[in-house]
Amino acid sequence: QEGKFSGPLKPMTFSIYEGQEPSQIIFQFKANPPAVTFELTGETDNIFVIEREGLLYYNRALDRETRSTHNLQVAALDANGIIVEGPVPITIKVKDINDNRPTFLQSKYEGSVRQNSRPGKPFLYVNATDLDDPATPNGQLYYQIVIQLPMINNVMYFQINNKTGAISLTREGSQELNPAKNPSYNLVISVKDMGGQSENSFSDTTSVDIIVTENIWKAPKPVEMVENSTDPHPIKITQVRWNDPGAQYSLVDKEKLPRFPFSIDQEGDIYVTQPLDREEKDAYVFYAVAKDEYGKPLSYPLEIHVKVKDINDNPPTCPSPVTVFEVQENERLGNSIGTLTAHDRDEENTANSFLNYRIVEQTPKLPMDGLFLIQTYAGMLQLAKQSLKKQDTPQYNLTIEVSDKDFKTLCFVQINVIDINDQIPIFEKSDYGNLTLAEDTNIGSTILTIQATDADEPFTGSSKILYHIIKGDSEGRLGVDTDPHTNTGYVIIKKPLDFETAAVSNIVFKAENPEPLVFGVKYNASSFAKFTLIVTDVNEAPQFSQHVFQAKVSEDVAIGTKVGNVTAKDPEGLDISYSLRGDTRGWLKIDHVTGEIFSVAPLDREAGSPYRVQVVATEVGGSSLSSVSEFHLILMDVNDNPPRLAKDYTGLFFCHPLSAPGSLIFEATDDDQHLFRGPHFTFSLGSGSLQNDWEVSKINGTHARLSTRHTEFEEREYVVLIRINDGGRPPLEGIVSLPVTFCSCVEGSCFRPAGHQTGIPTVGM
């Protein structure tokens, strides 16, 4: 017939299954004069032939794996062999059959994995090839682990991505693999074609030997670095190594320093980039991180400790330009006048900061020189020769040489002779009550004001008050500054408060004079006061990296397929546990450690896409604070819904007897996605026996006409089966039934005697 198997010369495409012996011609081209013959050129492979009269055929079975498309050209020639039409392209598409089995590229694979490697991160790929068409099930491969040897406690340590062949550790494998216990494993892996879904799929197996290696991602020993180094920088100080090459290293400064003098190169070598100053900062703690090429951490960060070693690069410094001490008139020989505390910024308790004190001059030398002595190492001034008289000499000036092992400094001390100290400081309140503060209250904050008074000579060491915390603050988190004019004490935070180590502190203050009390007078309860400091915990919830996470998968993914993942971090650095909320369809599960989301049930786009669930990130430990983010799973359509009738067609009737052949129109639909052009259904009768009575013809992609072929129908109901094909990939077919009644009519409607069956047809044709 013209059209399907014969016709004029024009570009055409034909699809032929491979492996089939030729059974019919491909096409008969018709010549228009003056054309008398046809010529075939292109990728004929001596298989495709055109006869002189235009008969195109093939002479042996095709093989898609040799050539999947034959690009041919056909030209019409006149009697002289001159092209008068064409050449036109003729494309032969060779359709695939499952005539090739999958084969692994290797019969044995070898790989290694580090203990504690991240679960789900591939460390080895097995790879099989199947010469069949990967766009069809024939070439779609499905990988599986058949057996793991040894299998300890029936726990799988390894898993395989059934589509990619990527082998990785399970969560149990990440936690439990230990080369000291079991250094090697063997897996038997199978691969099947037909997506693993068919009984007649071909398969192959391979063996995988896996060596478990030690994890060398370990924190190095603490480093000591001498300050003020004059060597050229940067200087390598230590190193970290990821287990495999190619890691991207970085350093994280948890302290957020304005100047961070360290760097790391892509070998994992850590450098100090400039000379350090111990007096600026004597120790550094930071973290080394290893990431993969996508910026994803390969493991936990390593803590790096750097201690800065001291050199004697600081001279002693005087506490002030002039240090003022007071001595009471009647003090006895040997009494302490005060201690000159010079400072040295070099490291405490080392020779670099060990100071010597020596008096080099006293003025006036009245009534004699050498009235004072200073303890060589302690710096304590003492009355050396006799008691002093205020009316004779009310003030002495001393020059004191303070030295460390390399430097000398002169300090100046003024000693005032004052009245006797016979009054003690008295607190205006003995109990300052409770004070509640958050643990993140700023250092330097004044949290309390205290006040004591002293009746001795004003503005002398006898009336000046020093406040000390004598109990309840062994860590030295608090301090008290005194206003010298009012003797008011301001309690300030010197070190960060810590809920974990000191939630409640019972603080006791003592008020004392710098000058000793006269003999017989003692400090009593009036010079003491207390208060209670309550510290509250501060905690921040984990933070998700995105407000909404989105992933896209085909609705037909295998159960257990990873469909997405979420990430959150805890500001306090606590581990995070992930969970799902609102998984109303029970389609998903989340790995509570990694945040990877897997399917646990068949997905269905037609039930609704995107599928929205909430993901919850909860701190592990601490106050278990949690945050919520959205996960949207976009489901891509596959052709998994057969066509059906668009509405209920019960009640179709023809008036009996038919005066002429009649017809009715019906509509089909399906639930799959039809982008742009809408469905393209084809319609045919559901069984051969119907063809004598009925005919079905397509009107458009969704509508068809059912027509009677004659008028000789009985007065009864006929059930006409219609086959509707959606032409999808794979094509799905629905067989629907149209009940058509032939009945006697009254005024164009079916007549039924009273009491007859229910469900009277209501639509006449």
């Epitope: 004069p33 003056p34 008398v36 002189r52 009697a79 062999g81 064409g86």
Partner: antibody, heavy 123, light 113 residues
Amino acid sequence: QVQLQQSDAELVKPGASVKISCKVSGYTFTDHTIHWMKQRPEQGLEWIGYIYPRDVITQYNEKFKGKATLTADKSSSTAYMQLNSLTSEDSAVYLCARWGYFYGSRSYYFDYWGQGTTLTVSS
Amino acid sequence: DIVMSQSPSSLAVSVGEKVTMSCKSSQSLLHSSNQKNYLAWYQQKPGQSPKVLIYWASTRESGVPDRFTGSGSGTDFTLTITSVKSEDLAVYYCQQYYSYPWTFGGGTRLEIK
């Protein structure tokens, strides 16, 4: 061997007609086209047209339409060219030639020629 | 119609000399589908019918001496005789078979000095 034997020289009066023959041998007559050329002394060759005996397809040079008529007799393997309304301008040597191409061959040229027929038109 | 122009119309050479003659067409003879030039060269000796030398512009017919060479493409073609012999005295025609009506050039007459 292939031969194309043309009819003998003709002397005809102006206004008359003449039919020149070209009898072939040594190959299947219907496989190849037969072409006719006109050659006047000291002038080049002019292509008149061809006939394909198998399907009796003809094609003419527009210049010779109405002047020449090409026919073939398969039974005698002979091609004919009739020239009518003759004038002195038609005086020339007329050559038949076989075009080398046939289905499956690649000979795109005139491979065999007749010996020529001299036509003289004179009163 | 495609007009074929040959030059020179005649030339005289001594035996052993090289000779080239030109043939130009009024439109391209190169067919896009097969990249062939639809041109042939013929030799017509005195008192004889023409005989093919070259077809497809450069393919030498079997039995033709290799001193005859055809070249060119599109609209410009050349016939070269590398070492003329006395038996090469003839008129040489080019002919196009790209489109009907087929046409011949006016010919180049080769004379021997």
